[in-house]
């Protein structure tokens, strides 16, 4: 689509005569008829296949024609066409005398013709005007002409349609040849693809407008090159998304178990020494004179029950003193003046003579102890419960109350972290000393196989004819976006040529 433009510049008819040689009365009021048609070796009458146009009266006898001539006419004259410019043409320009105001062909006598010129030739599309002058015996016409493309049409023959746009469907202007020229920040065949912030990570980042860098799930930062730790992570970092790699002093799946309780909480009092003993547990070694889990209690010398055989203890400035019951003596009432005849064994203990009856020994029944079987056995004194379990006396037996994560009579067994099936999407769980580990099936990753890793179905370049390939993340298959003129699941068929 384009326009043939004809610029009339000067017409000379000095004698003011018609083509017949007869003079115009009072002078030749001149207007022009223009016919544009396909190339003919010899220009003949017939339809103006490329268009025609008439002017109003432009002057009398000899005159120059101004641009945008008054009287409702246009100069240059416009002959639009809506086809591919063929590069050749025929042009007929007739000068006519208008005796009255009616310029229609049927209103004019045939002998009102002043002159007629016909030219033909090649003409390329372009901005430059071709200047021409045609002379007959009585008249001379000077004019110029050119062919230009209509708005939004480009190329050697005005056949390429290109309309600049800046919207969802493209961001471009048009070059003289009709090719697209992307606006700054856009790329791609139709300039629909934004150019992301320089350095934006190719896989982890994307953008919806130029110079942007938006991160895909699991990534953060200006260039989307930093991972985000797991949602439940407390004191950990990551090297890939959703990991939870514990900071120093923290343990557990979510790094929420304090392995350095001593440093973080300073639980031991009165100058005691603190030792970390596992997750959130510690042991305080008390200085002399202190007791309690955190060495928070001041120790009385008598608190250790030093007096035996029922002796009573009295605190003194320099220590303690045992008041012994009848039949006993010594610093701790440990010596007896009794014999088996005095029935010294309590709680069903049996008495055995020693040193020819000068002393005795008691053999105690289960659950009792002491030199006279006077003490009930505390089965928890030996701290039998492992891994921080709490010991409870239960009649003749004892039991251990275990901390979370441990089981067994003595809390000696670690409960499997895998018992609660923490691995998603069919991952295989492995118990490790440091916690659990999931081995993920293809297509999944992350600490618990919770991150779906897309398979790049486009890696094999399945799309033809410069089609754009996309991976359908829900099915891990490819989708081809065909360029204009091609169809098929791989864009392998030109339009109009169905598969054989």
């Amino acid at each position: 689509s384009g326009v043939f433009q004809l610029q009339l510049q000067e017409f000379v008819n000095e004698r003011g005569v018609l083509a017949s040689g007869r003079p115009c009365e009072p002078g030749c009021r001149t207007f022009f008829r223009v016919c544009l048609k396909h190339f003919q070796a010899v220009v003949s009458p017939g339809p103006c296949t490329f268009g025609s146009v008439s002017t109003p009266v432009l002057g009398t006898n000899s005159f120059a024609v101004r641009d945008d001539s008054s009287g409702g006419g246009r100069n240059p004259l416009q002959l639009p066409f809506n086809f591919t410019w063929p590069g050749t043409f025929s042009l007929i320009i007739e000068a006519w005398h208008a005796p009255g105001d009616d310029l229609r062909p049927e209103a004019l006598p045939p002998d009102a013709l002043i002159s007629k010129i016909a030219i033909q030739g090649s003409l390329a599309v372009g901005q430059n005007w071709l200047l021409d002058e045609q002379t007959s015996t009585l008249t001379r016409l000077r004019y110029s002409y050119r062919v230009i493309c209509s708005d939004n049409y480009y190329g050697d023959n005005c056949s390429r349609l290109c309309k600049k746009r800046n919207d969802h469907f493209g961001h471009y202007v048009c070059q003289p040849d009709g090719n697209l020229s992307c606006l700054p920040g856009w790329t791609g065949e139709y300039c629909q693809q934004p150019i992301c912030l320089s350095g934006c990570h190719e896989q982890n980042g994307y953008c919806s407008k130029p110079a942007e860098c938006l991160c895909r799930p699991g990534w953060q930062g200006r260039l989307c090159n930093e991972c985000i730790p797991h949602n439940g992570c407390r004191h950990g970092t990551c090297s890939t998304p959703w990991q939870c790699t514990c900071d120093e002093g923290w343990g557990g799946l979510f790094c929420d178990q304090d392995l350095n309780y001593c440093t973080h909480h300073s639980p031991c009092k009165n100058g005691a020494t603190c030792s970390n003993s596992g997750q959130r547990s510690y042991t305080c070694t008390c200085r002399p004179g202190y007791t309690g889990v955190d060495c928070e209690l001041e120790l009385s010398e008598c608190d250790s029950n030093p007096c035996r055989n029922g002796g009573s203890c009295k605190d003194q400035e320099d220590g303690y003193h045992c008041l012994c019951p009848p039949g006993y003596y010594g610093l701790h009432c440990e010596h007896s003046t009794l014999s088996c005849a005095d029935s010294p064994c309590f709680n069903g203990g049996s008495c055995r003579e020693r040193n020819q009856g000068a002393s005795y020994a008691c053999e105690c029944p289960p659950n009792f102890t002491g030199s006279n079987c006077e003490k009930k056995v505390d089965r928890c004194t030996s701290n039998p419960c492992a891994n921080g379990g709490q010991c409870l006396n239960r009649g003749p037996s004892r039991m251990c109350r275990c901390r979370p994560g441990f089981t067994g009579t003595y809390c000696e067994r670690h409960v499997s972290d895998c018992a609660r099936n923490p691995c998603a999407h069919g991952g295989t769980c492995h118990d490790l000393e440091s916690g659990l580990m999931c081995t993920c099936p293809a297509g999944f990753s992350g600490r618990r196989c919770e991150v779906r890793t897309s398979i790049d179905a486009c890696a094999s370049s399945p799309c033809f004819n410069r089609a754009t390939c996309y991976t359908d993340l829900s099915t891990d298959t490819f989708v081809c976006n065909c360029p204009y003129g091609f169809v098929g699941s791989r864009c392998e068929f030109p339009v109009g040529l169905p598969p054989s």
Epitope: L214, C215, G218, P229, N231, R234, G236, T237, R452
Partner: antibody, heavy 118, light 107 residues
Framework: EVQLVESGGGLVQPGGSLRLSCAAS????????MAWVRQAPGKGLEWVAT????????YYRDSVKGRFTISRDNAKNSLYLQMNSLRAEDTAVYYC???????????WGQGTLVTVSS | DIQMTQSPSSLSASVGDRVTITCRAS??????LAWYQQKPGKAPKLLIF???ILADGVPSRFSGSGSGTDFTLTISSLQPEDFATYFC?????????FGQGTKLEIK
């Protein structure tokens, strides 16, 4: 235990400013991206802004761009939201949350009410 | 922006009932969907992320399913403490957007 405690809310006139703070504890604050999410009275939840953990990259919803600024002080375990040119439609309970624009919000504060009214 | 549409907007049920709440996205959001529970005057609490992964400490009666545009939150046997408002949220596109909420009430 993870704790996020917001403060700084209150009544402000249209066009006025307010600065919200969020004190974080129970996790290593500097390791995690943070966000502000708001909830207008009786309405749903609306993401407002996000800041990354290390380089402090920020993102905002379109309606607050140029008016709100999210920032953090890792040394103080604190998150902030500076709100300028406040409008009636900014009236909401503002929650401090741990998360990014592309991840779930794993932990939330109790919220602080911002009322914009003349 | 991606529109998230929850249904129903409110729901009455009894303790022990099985309850299902659905959430539809206006575009494919893959598996990037979370569910939250919110009680009056309280902050939301994360229940489920990545469509079906239970957040730490969330009872196993809660479960999630779906992909693409259609997602479901199921509570297998309602407990008294489950009566609350539930929100879905997509985090596949910027800005992240929430559903309008489903209020679960005692029948």
């Amino acid at each position: 235990e993870v704790q996020l405690v917001e403060s700084g809310g209150g009544l402000v006139q249209p066009g006025g400013s307010l600065r919200l703070s969020c004190a974080a504890s129970g996790f290593t604050f500097s390791n995690f991206p943070m966000a502000w999410v708001r909830q207008a009275p009786g309405k749903g939840l609306e993401w407002v802004a996000t800041i990354s953990s290390s380089d402090g990259t920020t993102y905002y919803r379109d309606s607050v761009k140029g008016r709100f600024t999210i920032s953090r002080d890792n040394a103080k375990n604190s998150l902030y939201l500076q709100m300028n040119s406040l409008r009636a439609e900014d009236t909401a309970v503002y929650y401090c949350a741990r998360g990014y624009y592309n991840s779930p919000f794993a932990y939330w504060g109790q919220g602080t009410l911002v009322t914009v009214s003349s | 922006d991606i529109q998230m549409t929850q249904s129903p907007s409110s729901l009455s049920a009894s303790v022990g009932d099985r309850v299902t709440i659905t959430c539809r996205a206006s575009q494919d959001i893959y598996y990037n969907l979370a569910w939250y529970q919110q009680k009056p005057g309280k902050a939301p609490k994360l229940l489920i992320f990545d469509t079906n992964i239970l957040a730490d400490g969330v009872p196993s009666r809660f479960s999630g399913s779906g992909s693409g545009t259609d997602f479901t939150l199921t509570i297998s046997s309602l407990q008294p403490e489950d009566f609350a408002t539930y929100f879905c949220q997509q985090y596949d596109y910027v800005p992240p957007t929430f559903g309008q909420g489903t209020k679960l009430e005692i029948k």
